[in-house]
């Protein structure tokens, strides 16, 4: 009867040890999707429209690497900007590297010309720290060139090839960006 | 509109622990930065707590640092303040915020 009960206790805790590994699996794999959480995102909300259409990014989108932009043609303030990006899958810009500020400004040039294009840059106005929207902060050559006297909120925005900072309820056009999907040929 | 519901206040002992909580509606609670303030009696608003969008880069006001965590749960759009080894200076009402936007706030009370 002991040998019995001992026997059942190693099933047990080899049962446990499954068990654990299996968890320890699951909380990798939770890991590793909330770091890929934007491509995650992506990929899910366009996984079934690329079924029909092969493109990387969807009609009226600009690409360059793996990011997709949309360049508004509405003006809007920065917290509607952001909801209407969201809406799109896709987050207010978030410029990286100087080569990606050289895009985008490049582009502008050639689409709009010298207009107000809100980007995900908000500070904070207690601390004065400038976070992009996924909490980092920007590259120090990517600061907003002016800090806005203005008591409000302040966000920052993109004209010609500068960025710059403004009363969050200003009305502006925006730009957002989303991971471009991966060709699967 | 944007509306935050801050929660868990209350009065604690010197080195005691809280857990503050702020639900949000009204907005796309995972696409924003949120941030923790607080105001302690007589003073201004001091920043507290970041955290990114998708609960990456938090960072905290060096009096905090190391005691407190800020934390958020996107599914359930709620942010979250762990306070633990709290000391009498960090009795203040606190907020949670985005964007400039601020709750109504819950009080912590540090005393023995």
């Known amino acids: 009867k002991l040998l019995q009960v001992s026997t059942i206790a190693m099933q047990q805790q080899e049962k446990l040890i499954q068990q654990e590994r299996a968890l320890l699996n699951f909380t990798e794999w939770k890991r590793s999707c909330a770091l890929q959480m934007k491509y995650c995102q992506a990929f899910m909300q366009n996984s079934l429209s690329s079924a029909h259409n092969s493109s990387p990014c969807p009609n009226n989108w600009i690409q360059n690497r793996e990011s997709c932009y949309y360049v508004s043609e509405i003006w809007s303030i920065w917290h509607t900007s952001q909801e209407n990006c969201l809406k799109e899958g896709s987050t207010l810009l978030q410029i990286e590297s100087k080569e990606e500020m050289d895009f985008i400004t490049g582009s502008l040039r050639k689409i709009k010309g010298s207009y107000d294009y809100w980007v995900g840059l908000s500070q904070d106005g207690h601390s004065g720290r400038w976070l992009w929207q996924d909490g980092s902060s920007p590259s120090p050559g990517l600061l907003p060139a002016e800090r806005s006297q203005s008591a409000n909120q302040v966000c920052g925005y993109v004209k010609s090839n500068s960025l710059l900072s403004s009363n969050c309820s200003t009305w502006k056009y925006f730009i957002c960006e989303k991971y471009a999907l991966r060709s699967s040929v | 509109q944007v509306q935050l519901v801050e929660s868990g206040g209350g009065l604690v002992q010197p080195g005691g622990s809280l857990r503050l909580s702020c639900a949000a509606s009204?907005?796309?609670?995972?696409?924003?930065?949120m941030s923790w303030v607080r105001q302690a009696p007589g003073k201004g608003l001091e920043w507290v707590a970041s955290i990114g969008s998708g609960g990456g880069y938090p960072s905290y006001t060096g009096s905090v640092e190391g005691r407190f965590t800020i934390s958020r749960d996107n599914a359930k759009n709620t942010l979250y303040l762990l306070m633990n080894n709290l000391k009498p200076d960090d009795t203040a009402v606190y907020y949670c915020?985005?964007?400039?936007?601020r709750g109504q706030g819950t009080q912590v009370t540090v005393s023995s």
């Open positions: 009204g907005f796309t609670f995972s696409g924003y930065v």
């Open positions: 915020e985005m964007l400039g936007r």
